[in-house]
Each structure stands twice: as structure tokens, then as C-alpha cells.
Interface confidence: low
């Protein structure tokens, strides 16, 4: 029996509305407009499976639902990569695949999805509540990351009936279903806009979740403008860390991570702008990454009450901009 957890990675925020028009007339068109605008926004899905016959064997599958070309995929466990997570595998379309124990087999399934088999025994083996994260770097969307773990109820030792949910079916159903709804919605929206084109259009309230013009890193693919800041839906569960993570190292997470001020989420990317004030470049658990904020010191969009910002232990590497010539 396989148990699996499919994690929806992104949740588009709802822009506020302001204007003299009645809500009944406007809510649907503007919700549809939001859907149409964000329809092209990439998403990352993560699926974690555990084989009942091999309790220490996990299969992680990740996919990127976007139009851009993928330049790199990083799979980690124990939390987001660079935020307490341990790198398990790196898949590069041209350079190849690198994997680290207990990863046994990492491979590309399609041009936009990968799978990773973990095997371990004793200290190096994952356990049921380990969090697995996948980060996709793509052009022009930037970096997107989502995490997933087996739900507590998915203990393969339980005599629950098997749940062979075909991933292909789920993916296609989701893609086709959403695409169909969006297509219909967009057509309907155009219809409504044509009917109401003589009316004054309501102003969109400046949303606090709208990022400034993105600034790409010197070494990263430039990121296309995003309509909104998307926060992945994922639970960081590090209560079961690999026993090999015993010595003090950059991943040891101080308890004050959770109270990190939101303006510390990103680091300015100038050659020396961050020299005296180390702030993580990819510290936040936010899907859109490659340079969301126009200037250092600018307060980034409000990330919501449940979002924890994770400093990047790759201080040495995460923040360099043009200093590291690639």
C-alpha cells in the first residue's frame, strides 16, 4: 500500500476592491479577472509516498506547472533548501544529476517533473513526518519551492484500505479542470466587460501582496513580473530530522527564526551592499524568489500570520550577486 500527500503549492491572494459599483455586479468579474491574470503563474507540486513493504523507503515526486524552461531542481528534506533543509539531490538539465545519501535514485520523469527514491536504514533513513521540499529554478519565472510530507494518518502500518490515487489522473484532472474553468471564466469575463464597458471601471486597491518590480540576481535568470506574491501551502515539520544532523552547522535553527522581522527576508544584490549587514537572500519561505524588492531596506509585502521566514544558511553563497563569477 502506498500512502501519499499531494501538497498544493500556491495560493493566490485576493486583491481588495474599491469603487462605487455594487458588489454583486463586480465581485465575479474581478475574481475572474484575478484568475485570468494569475492563470499563467507557475506552481510547484510535491508528492511524497512511502512503501508499506519498505518503511524506510520514500518516493518523492515533484513537478513544475509553468511555461518556462527549468534550469535546476533541488530536492531537500527537513525543510526548504537553505533553510534548515538537507540537500538530497540536484538535477540539472544539461550538467546532470547529483544525489546525496540517502537518496538512491533521482531522475527526470518529464521535462518538468522529477522523482527521487530515498532508501535508508537507521540514522540516515527518513521517517514518516519528514518534510521534503522541491525547488524549481526556471526562466523566466524565477525560483519556486514547495514542500510536502506524509500526513500523520498515512501510517502504512495501519490497516487502512489502499489508496492508489494515480498521480497522472490527479494532475491531468487538476490541470484540465482548472484550465477549463479559467477558459470559461475568461470568456465570461470578456463578455461581462463588453456589457459593462460604458460603466466606470473600479480601481484596484493597491494590494500589500503585490511585489515591487522584480530585480533578478546577476547570476540567475531574470524573473518575469508576477501579478502577486504567492506563498506555498506547506507545513515545515522538522521533528524527525536525520540523526546525522548532530553537529553544529549552518542548519541548526535558532528559535528566533520564527520572530525574524519580515524585512529580513531578502538581501540586496549589489556587489557590496550586504557586506556589513548579512541578510539572507533566499531566506524566506516564499515561492517567488529571484529579487522581489526593488531596494534594500524596503519592507516587503506582508506575508501573513502563519508564514515563518527561514534564514539562508548559505550566507556565503546565497547573497553574492556579481561577486561569484559563473
Amino acid at each position: 500500500m502506498r500512502t501519499e500527500a499531494q501538497v498544493p503549492a500556491l495560493q493566490p491572494p485576493e486583491p481588495g476592491l474599491e469603487g462605487a459599483m455594487g458588489h454583486r455586479t463586480l465581485v465575479l468579474p474581478w475574481v475572474l479577472l484575478t484568475l485570468c491574470v494569475t492563470a499563467g503563474t507557475p506552481e510547484v507540486w510535491v508528492q511524497v509516498r512511502m512503501e508499506a513493504t519498505e518503511l524506510s523507503s520514500f518516493t518523492i515526486r515533484c513537478g513544475f506547472l509553468g511555461s518556462g524552461s527549468i534550469s535546476l531542481v533541488t530536492v531537500s528534506w527537513g525543510g526548504p533548501n537553505g533553510a534548515g533543509g538537507t540537500t538530497l539531490a540536484v538535477l540539472h538539465p544539461e550538467r546532470g544529476i547529483r544525489q546525496w545519501a540517502p537518496a538512491r535514485q533521482a531522475r527526470w520523469e518529464t521535462q518538468s517533473s522529477i522523482s527521487l527514491i530515498l532508501e535508508g536504514s537507521g540514522a540516515s533513513s527518513p521517517c514518516a513526518n519528514t518534510t521534503f521540499c522541491c525547488k524549481f529554478a526556471s526562466f523566466p519565472e524565477g525560483s519556486w519551492e514547495a514542500c510536502g510530507s506524509l500526513p500523520p494518518s498515512s501510517d502504512p502500518g495501519l490497516s487502512a484500505p489502499p489508496t492508489p490515487a494515480p498521480i497522472l489522473r490527479a494532475d491531468l484532472a487538476g490541470i484540465l479542470g482548472v484550465s477549463g474553468v479559467l477558459l470559461f471564466g475568461c470568456v465570461y469575463l470578456l463578455h461581462l466587460l463588453r456589457r459593462h464597458k460604458h460603466r466606470p471601471a473600479p480601481r484596484l486597491q493597491p494590494s500589500r501582496t503585490s511585489p515591487q518590480a522584480p530585480r533578478a540576481r546577476a547570476w540567475a535568470p531574470s524573473q518575469a513580473s508576477q501579478a502577486a506574491l504567492h506563498v506555498p501551502y506547506a507545513t515545515i515539520n522538522t521533528s524527525c530530522r536525520p540523526a546525522t544532523l548532530d553537529t553544529a552547522h549552518p542548519h541548526g535553527g535558532p528559535s528566533w527564526w520564527a520572530s525574524l522581522p519580515t524585512h529580513a527576508a531578502h538581501r540586496p544584490q549589489g556587489p557590496a551592499a550586504w557586506a556589513s549587514t548579512p541578510i539572507p537572500a533566499r531566506g524566506s519561505f516564499v515561492s517567488v524568489e529571484n529579487g522581489l524588492y526593488a531596494q534594500a531596506g524596503e519592507r516587503p509585502p506582508h506575508t501573513g500570520p502563519g508564514l515563518t521566514l527561514f534564514p539562508d544558511p548559505r550566507g556565503p553563497r546565497a547573497m553574492e550577486g556579481p561577486l561569484g563569477v559563473r
Epitope: 544525489q99 546525496w100 547570476w219 546525522t244 549552518p250 535558532p254
Partner: antibody, heavy 127, light 112 residues
């Protein structure tokens, strides 16, 4: 246990190129992040560049940009460092270095953890 | 680049006695995650460098406990509680906070 064995000493003329090899044993090259560090006679250590596993690319110190190329042959688990347009000040011992897979680098997040070093390759640039 | 300055450049020591080497960086090496990105290496005569201490105060695998690292921000110290004959060589500090990582000039430890 990771072990690194480097190629033998080289004598080159100014303007020429040198290619130093570093053979990995104990692990496959694809599991490691290889760095190259050099040491001029009587001088200190100088990092030249290395592989960044997250970005899947090799990063070079700006000082060597355009002159150094670090490559890998995964079929033989051998890393190479080629330095072109040699000058007399490039006379040095060149080391490859990586992590032993039991340090923090093996867990991601710390790519300059170099606890396994090759024996060094002496490159002499002289006319 | 971050400039690393070591002192003293030469340190004559007595066997069995403690020794201390200082390393100062031009920029703080304390990262927001609470770790200091400073390593210590020892290069024994005629050998390749070997890692002693990483992230400021963590002994690398196989390193005797007579070696200890301390300090934070820009000032760091490597201490040898009781110097042994095999400890002679050149000690280097290295910052790993910024690309490129940079080394100090080295401190040569020799027996008096």
C-alpha cells in the same frame, strides 16, 4: 572515505596553459563539490573556484575569470582545472579539495567546507 | 574581498604549553543564522592543508580536542591547550561568508 589524487608536476612557458587533474576515489565525483586552491611559493592559500551543487554550476574567483576552467569527467570521476595565459606569478602548488561527506557540506548549505585535499600539483611557469 | 589578518605571523611555542592565534576579518563573519563563517586550517611542513575548525568553533572530524576555536563577528581565536610536536606548521584562518573565500596570511607555529 574520500581520497583525491592529483596529476604530477608541470613546467610551462609563459602564455601556455596547464591542465591539472584530480582523481576521486571512495565516492563518485557527482556526490562531491570540488574546489581548487593554489599556494604560491612561501605564500598563503588562494581559492580559485569550485562547484556549487545548488546552482549546478562552477563559480570562479573574479581574479581568475576568463583564465580558469574547471571541468569534470564523471565517467572517470576526475576533476580538471585548466589555467591559461600562464604568467610567472602562476607558479604555485595547486590543490583540489572537497568535503568528506560527513561534514555540514554533505547536508547542504555550506559549500566551502574543504576537509579532504589532494596532495597538490606543482606548476612552474618559466621561460 | 574580505581581508583576513592573522597575528602573530610567527609563534614560537613550548611543548605542553598553550598557544593562541588571532584572526581578524575586515567584515563581520556572523551570519543571521547565528553561525560565524570562519574556518581554521593547519598546513604541516610538506603536506596539504587540513581542516581543524569550521564555523568558528566546531572541530572537524578526527581533530584532537586540544584544538578549540572561539570568537564572533570579526575577531576569532584558535587555541591549542597543550602544544604537541605534531602541531607545528602554518595555521590559516579562512572566511567562508563571501565569495571568494579568503585566507589569512598564515601563522607559523614552531617549537622553541
Amino acid at each position: 572515505e574520500v581520497q583525491l589524487v592529483q596529476s604530477g608536476a608541470e613546467v610551462k612557458k609563459p602564455g601556455a596553459s596547464v591542465k591539472v587533474s584530480c582523481k576521486v576515489s571512495g565516492y563518485t565525483l557527482t556526490e562531491l563539490s570540488m574546489h581548487w586552491v593554489r599556494q604560491a611559493p612561501g605564500k598563503g592559500l588562494e581559492w580559485m573556484g569550485g562547484f556549487d551543487p545548488e546552482d549546478g554550476e562552477t563559480i570562479y574567483a573574479q581574479k581568475f575569470q576568463g583564465r580558469v576552467t574547471m571541468t569534470e569527467d564523471t565517467s572517470t570521476d576526475t576533476a580538471y582545472m585548466e589555467l591559461s595565459s600562464l604568467r610567472s606569478e602562476d607558479t604555485a602548488v595547486y590543490y583540489c579539495a572537497t568535503d568528506s561527506r560527513d561534514g555540514p557540506a554533505a547536508r547542504g548549505g555550506y559549500y566551502y567546507y574543504m576537509d579532504v585535499w589532494g596532495q597538490g600539483t606543482t606548476v612552474t611557469v618559466s621561460s | 574581498d574580505v581581508v583576513m589578518t592573522q597575528s602573530p605571523l610567527s609563534l614560537p611555542v613550548t611543548l605542553g604549553q598553550p598557544a593562541s592565534i588571532s584572526c581578524r576579518s575586515s567584515q563581520s563573519l556572523l551570519y543571521i543564522n547565528g553561525y560565524n563563517y570562519l574556518d581554521w586550517y593547519l598546513q604541516k611542513p610538506g603536506q596539504s592543508p587540513q581542516l581543524l575548525i569550521y564555523l568558528g568553533s566546531n572541530r572537524a572530524s578526527g581533530v584532537p580536542d586540544r584544538f578549540s576555536g572561539s570568537g564572533s563577528g570579526t575577531d576569532f581565536t584558535l587555541k591549542i591547550s597543550r602544544v604537541e610536536a605534531e602541531d607545528v606548521g602554518v595555521y590559516y584562518c579562512m572566511q567562508a561568508l563571501q565569495t571568494p573565500p579568503t585566507f589569512g596570511q598564515g601563522t607559523k607555529v614552531e617549537i622553541k
